[in-house]
């Protein structure tokens, strides 16, 4: 009975996500068969989040809308370890929007999910950000500095990275 009700709950939860994510990849968390964490297929997972590299080129606003439709946001990077995981899936000759912007042009950078902007946990390329007109952040590769962040014009189409919390069933 207990297992039956658990299965019913799982199925109803899966139906919630089916509209945007017809296929989920789930792994057992820890030793308890009861707890599964899932990411949409073919998203990648790291710690408690799922990531999707969008190769379509769109402006920052359209990229964020695109992530939002999938129940995600443009990526918020909280640690060096998280960035190191993300860059494994990026192409060196491309740039990718982050969920970081300065819409007022006053160098008040803000993350899309309202995570406080912490100057101590940023990975700007040297000399960046450097232009008040450039109000959106990308991550890209520079041969001298490897991967880092740069400010660019928000309306210039780029690839992007979406991030969502893992789905627990």
């Amino acid at each position: 009975n207990f297992m039956y009700s658990k299965t019913v709950k799982r199925l109803s939860k899966l139906r919630e996500y089916q509209q945007y994510h017809p296929s989920l990849t789930c792994v057992m968390e820890g030793k308890d068969i009861e707890d599964w964490s899932c990411c949409p297929t073919p998203w990648t997972s790291f710690q408690s989040s799922c990531y999707f590299i969008s190769t379509g080129m769109q402006s920052w606003t359209k990229s964020q809308k695109n992530c939002s439709v999938m129940g995600a946001d443009l990526v918020v990077i909280n640690t060096r370890e998280e960035q190191d995981f993300i860059i494994q899936n990026l192409k060196r000759n491309s740039s990718y929007f982050l969920g970081l912007s300065d819409p007022g042009g006053r160098r008040h950078w803000q993350w899309v999910d309202q995570t406080p902007y912490n100057e101590n946990v940023t990975f700007w390329h040297s000399g960046e950000p450097n232009n008040l007109d450039e109000r959106c952040a990308i991550i890209n590769f520079r041969s001298s500095e490897e991967w880092g962040w740069n400010d660019i014009h928000c309306h210039v189409p780029q690839k992007s990275i979406c991030k969502m919390k893992k789905i627990y069933i």
């Epitope: 359209k62 964020q64 007022g104 042009g105 008040l132 014009h153 928000c154 309306h155 210039v156």
Partner: antibody
């Protein structure tokens, strides 16, 4: 008073090259993102190129990508548009304009009087 | 690319009467409460002049008989009381995503 003065237009044969200039005064030129916009005879407006204030980021529509190059010399308060492999459809009045950000978008707030480019054999 | 479609192509209005120009974007140009549509006026032999930005914000120095409205994909420029000096071609433009694109223009004349 903001002034933008374009020059360098003229008659050129198909396949030829031309370099347009835009001399700016009345603004702190080195802090402005700048754009070129063109207007074919009797037609509407078409964005051609944009360059950021430092000159390290440039953007073009597909119609001119690989043929046109926007650049700037902040010490001379001057914007340039190098146009190569010109075609008849590039015939237009070319305007330079200052770019002003608006949240995630922008506006073109000051415009020059334009310089005419005619591509014809 | 985002296509901006203006209507009508031309408009004849009596002095002192209202003129309304429409602009339709092929996809939404809104984000976070702002619309990325601008309106420009171009008189014969002159460069374009910015009138309205962000769909409804009047540019400094522009008479308040000009107003803009709309959101999403549908936008309107209104001249509440047409003056002789308003004879011009009016263009809408989106700045949400490159390439920036303009409407085909609406010619406003006096009836």
């Amino acid at each position: 008073e903001v002034q933008l003065l374009e020059s360098g237009g003229g008659l050129v044969q198909p396949g030829g090259s031309l370099r347009l200039s835009c001399a700016a005064s009345g603004i702190t030129f080195s802090t402005y993102t700048m754009s070129w916009v063109r207007q074919a005879p009797g037609k509407g407006l078409e964005w051609v190129a944009t360059i950021n204030s430092g000159g390290d980021n440039t953007y073009y529509p597909d119609s001119v990508k690989g043929r046109f190059t926007i650049s700037r010399d902040n010490s001379k308060n001057t914007l340039y548009l190098q146009m190569n492999s010109l075609r008849a459809e590039d015939t237009a009045v070319y305007y330079c304009a200052t770019y002003r950000p608006y949240y995630y978008g922008s506006v073109l707030d000051y415009w020059g009087q334009g310089t005419t480019v005619t591509v014809s054999s | 690319d985002i296509v901006m479609t203006q209507s009508p192509d031309s408009l004849a209005v009596s002095l002192g009467e209202r003129a309304t120009i429409n602009c339709k974007a092929s996809q939404s140009v809104d984000y976070d409460g702002n619309s990325y549509v601008n309106w420009y006026q171009q008189k014969p032999g002159q460069p374009p002049k910015l009138l309205i930005y962000g769909a409804s914000n009047l540019e400094s120095g522009i008479p308040d008989r000009f107003s803009g409205s709309g959101s999403g994909t549908d936008f309107t420029l209104t001249i509440s009381s047409l003056q002789a000096e308003d004879v011009a071609v009016y263009y809408c433009q989106q700045s949400d995503e490159d390439p920036w694109t303009f409407g085909g223009g609406t010619k406003v004349e006096i009836k």
